[in-house]
Structure formats: structure tokens, C-alpha cells
């Protein structure tokens, strides 16, 4: 069971300092941006991180949404990352959900975060280069200290 608590506005960056944004095709991508670029590209660079109470002791449960024309929420259904047109629900009556991730602070690195899928244990949001694009994907942690699954989250409110 997950019960919604509060939400905050955040900018999410990978460890190469690239900013996560949602492009015109609704794809989550990372790109080099100055602070003014980041502001100019809002609301596509501003993510709504909604926190949820979890009935099990597993960590800070969150959804990640973005509001352009409508609100879309990040999903990892079938281990494929996409934004679905939906509001983060007030309650989820299940112990797993494709839209719930556990936001974890990496021990020894308080400012570095990981997002583990509640549906697929051991799978994390990651940044992966594909041709010229840096894409947000879901990835099984396959090596210790994998930097691609670490992010910084900067609160904007």
C-alpha cells in the first residue's frame, strides 16, 4: 500500500551534470544545459517528485511527474521507461507499482540519489547513451559503484 504525502519541484541531473528533460515527443532525455537554459526550458526540466508512505520498510517511495500541457507520470511498465498521461494517484493498493520508485541516498554520498523500481527489485533508473542521445532507461545494477544509476536532485521550491 502506498499513500501520497507531499510533492516537491525538482531538477534532476546525471553525474555528468546533464539535465533531465522531457522532449516534444514525451521522451525523457539528458542534455547539457546552463542554469538559464534550464529555466528557459521549464516546465520540461522541472519534475514533480511526489512522496508516498509505504506500508513496508523499503525506503522513500516517490513518483516522478512533469506538467507540460497535462501531467504525465514516469512508468517502467515491462521495464520500459515512458511518461504516461496521468496524475500521481492518492493511493496505490499494492506493494508494487510501475510508477513508484524508491529514492535512495547512496551511503557516503548524501547528495547522490538512486531510484529503484518498486516493480522490479534491483532495477534502477539510469542514463544511457544511444547514438547521439542520452536517454533515461531502467537498468539492472550490474556493477558496483555504477555511476549511470546515480543522480543529483535539486529542489526548486
Amino acid at each position: 500500500y502506498f499513500g501520497k504525502l507531499e510533492s516537491k519541484l525538482s531538477v534532476i541531473r546525471n553525474l555528468n551534470d546533464q539535465v533531465l528533460f522531457i522532449d516534444q515527443g514525451n521522451r525523457p532525455l539528458f542534455e547539457d544545459m546552463t542554469d538559464s537554459d534550464c529555466r528557459d526550458n521549464a516546465p520540461r526540466t522541472i519534475f514533480i517528485i511526489s512522496m508516498y508512505k509505504d506500508s513496508q520498510p523499503r525506503g522513500m517511495a516517490v513518483t516522478i511527474s512533469v506538467k507540460c500541457e497535462k501531467i504525465s507520470t514516469l512508468s517502467c511498465e515491462n521495464k520500459i521507461i515512458s511518461f504516461k498521461e496521468m496524475n500521481p494517484p492518492d493511493n496505490i493498493k499494492d506493494t508494487k507499482s510501475d510508477i513508484i520508485f524508491f529514492q535512495r541516498s547512496v551511503p557516503g554520498h548524501d547528495n547522490k540519489m538512486q531510484f529503484e523500481s518498486s516493480s522490479y527489485e534491483g532495477y534502477f533508473l539510469a542514463c544511457e547513451k544511444e547514438r547521439d542521445l542520452f536517454k533515461l532507461i531502467l537498468k539492472k545494477e550490474d556493477e558496483l559503484g555504477d555511476r549511470s544509476i546515480m543522480f543529483t536532485v535539486q529542489n526548486e521550491d
Epitope: L5, M51, K53, P57, M60, R104, V106, P107, D110, L144
Partner: antibody, heavy 120, light 110 residues
Framework: EVQLVQSGAEVKKPGSSVKVSCKAS????????ISWVRQAPGQGLEWMGW?????????FYAQKFQGRVTITADESTSTAYMELSSLRSEDTAVYYC????????????WGQGTLVTVSS | QSVLTQPPSASGTPGQRVTISCSGS????????VNWYQQLPGTAPKLLIY???HRPSGVPDRFSGSKSGTSASLAISGLQSEDEADYYC???????????FGGGTKLTVL
């Protein structure tokens, strides 16, 4: 770097209560669970319970301590408290607070410990 | 009596590799991650290994963790005198709905 600083040693009479504090500095206090773990002289570690200030002060206690322990937090001062009542000699121990930032059960930061001695 | 079972003591000479075991059941280690803590004499415990085999930054790679079935182990290679400490394993126990520690293993560097 987060630091947890605990209150000083206490000597208490059997039947009384003790309240130990744990002040956090250098991090986001209300995002993480704070657990309390005790260690009797020459013995191992024993988990007592946690508070998750982020979850509006949600607490969870180990069965053994239920009814006797109360864990609270004051967000304004980034301080967690553990109160243990009906003290007996077996409660003589070092009491540690521990922060869990990665997972509620991964104690990645510990206070220095507070020795509580229960003696008549 | 601890829910997780560790040998009370272990020893080795400098440079050696030592392993400390932690045995549990399906209600704890069998279905949950294992963490390891090091407690140097007179100090608070310190997180050494989390999530079976992950090291926090600052922990030397001489320390490694593994898990198989309902048991876990901590390996220390290239043993050094400063490794002399108590080591505790920890897991979640569904039957008691609480986190549990092993009884601790006192490591002596001869």
C-alpha cells in the same frame, strides 16, 4: 557529512525513565528514518525501533520494547529522542541513534552513543 | 540467542584472508538483503557492507560481502592490524517484523 550528536551519560534508578537525544547536523533531517540500537556491556547490538520524521513522525518499535519505549522527533531542531520507561538493571547499555538514508534498515551514520546505567 | 548466527570469534595473521559467516533462515536472510557493520573497540558501529555486497565510499575494497540462500559472509583480504574489531551482520526478519543482528564476531589479528 551528516553528524549525529547524542546527549550525555545518565545514571537512573530502577523503575524510572530516561530520555536520550540525538541531534542531526549537515543533512536533511526529515527525509530519513532514525533508529535506536542498544548494546549492553560486552554484548551485541539490539534494535529498539525507528521514527521516520518524513512520514509525519511514523514510529515502529521492536516487539520486545513495545509499551516501554517512545521515539519522537522535533523537526525544528533536527533532534530525535528515545524515552525508555520502567527501567531495570538489564537496561544498562550504550544507546545509539543511527540514521538510515539509503533504506530504513541500512544504518549509514551513527551517533557516538549514550551510556545509561540503571542502578539502585 | 540471536536470530542470525555468527561465530563468536575469528582470527588471522596480517596479510591473510578471513571469512566471517552469518546464518539465518527464509524469514530473514533468505528473502532480504544483508548488511555488515564493523565496531572498533570503544566506538560506535560503522556501516561496512550494505545490500549484500555494496561498499559505502571510504570502505577499502579488501572488504567484500556475499549471500547465498539463507547465509551470508563477509570476507576480509590482506588482513591488517586495524581490522581487529567486532563484526555484525544484520537483516530484516519478516516473522518478527523487525530488523535483527547477528551476535557478533570478534576478529583478532595475530
Amino acid at each position: 557529512e551528516v553528524q549525529l550528536v547524542q546527549s550525555g551519560a545518565e545514571v537512573k534508578k530502577p523503575g524510572s525513565s530516561v530520555k536520550v537525544s540525538c541531534k542531526a547536523s549537515g543533512g536533511t533531517f526529515n527525509s530519513y528514518a532514525i533508529s535506536w540500537v542498544r548494546q549492553a556491556p560486552g554484548q551485541g547490538l539490539e534494535w529498539m525501533g525507528w521514527i521516520n520524521p518524513f512520514y509525519i513522525g511514523e514510529t515502529f518499535y521492536a516487539q520486545k520494547f513495545q509499551g516501554r519505549v517512545t521515539i519522537t522527533a522535533d523537526e525544528s531542531t533536527s533532534t530525535a529522542y528515545m524515552e525508555l520507561s520502567s527501567l531495570r538493571s538489564e537496561d544498562t547499555a550504550v544507546y545509539y541513534c543511527a540514521r538510515a538514508a539509503y533504506h530504513p534498515l541500512v544504518f549509514d551514520n551513527w551517533g557516538q552513543g549514550t551510556l545509561v546505567t540503571v542502578s539502585s | 540467542q540471536s536470530v542470525l548466527t555468527q561465530p563468536p570469534s575469528a582470527s588471522g595473521t596480517p596479510g591473510q584472508r578471513v571469512t566471517i559467516s552469518c546464518s539465518g533462515s527464509s524469514s530473514n536472510i533468505g528473502n532480504h538483503y544483508v548488511n555488515w557493520y564493523q565496531q572498533l573497540p570503544g566506538t560506535a558501529p560503522k556501516l561496512l557492507i550494505y545490500r549484500n555486497n555494496h561498499r559505502p565510499s571510504g570502505v577499502p575494497d579488501r572488504f567484500s560481502g556475499s549471500k547465498s540462500g539463507t547465509s551470508a559472509s563477509l570476507a576480509i583480504s590482506g588482513l591488517q592490524s586495524e581490522d581487529e574489531a567486532d563484526y555484525y551482520c544484520q537483516s530484516w526478519d519478516y516473522s518478527g517484523f523487525s530488523t535483527v543482528f547477528g551476535g557478533g564476531t570478534k576478529l583478532t589479528v595475530l
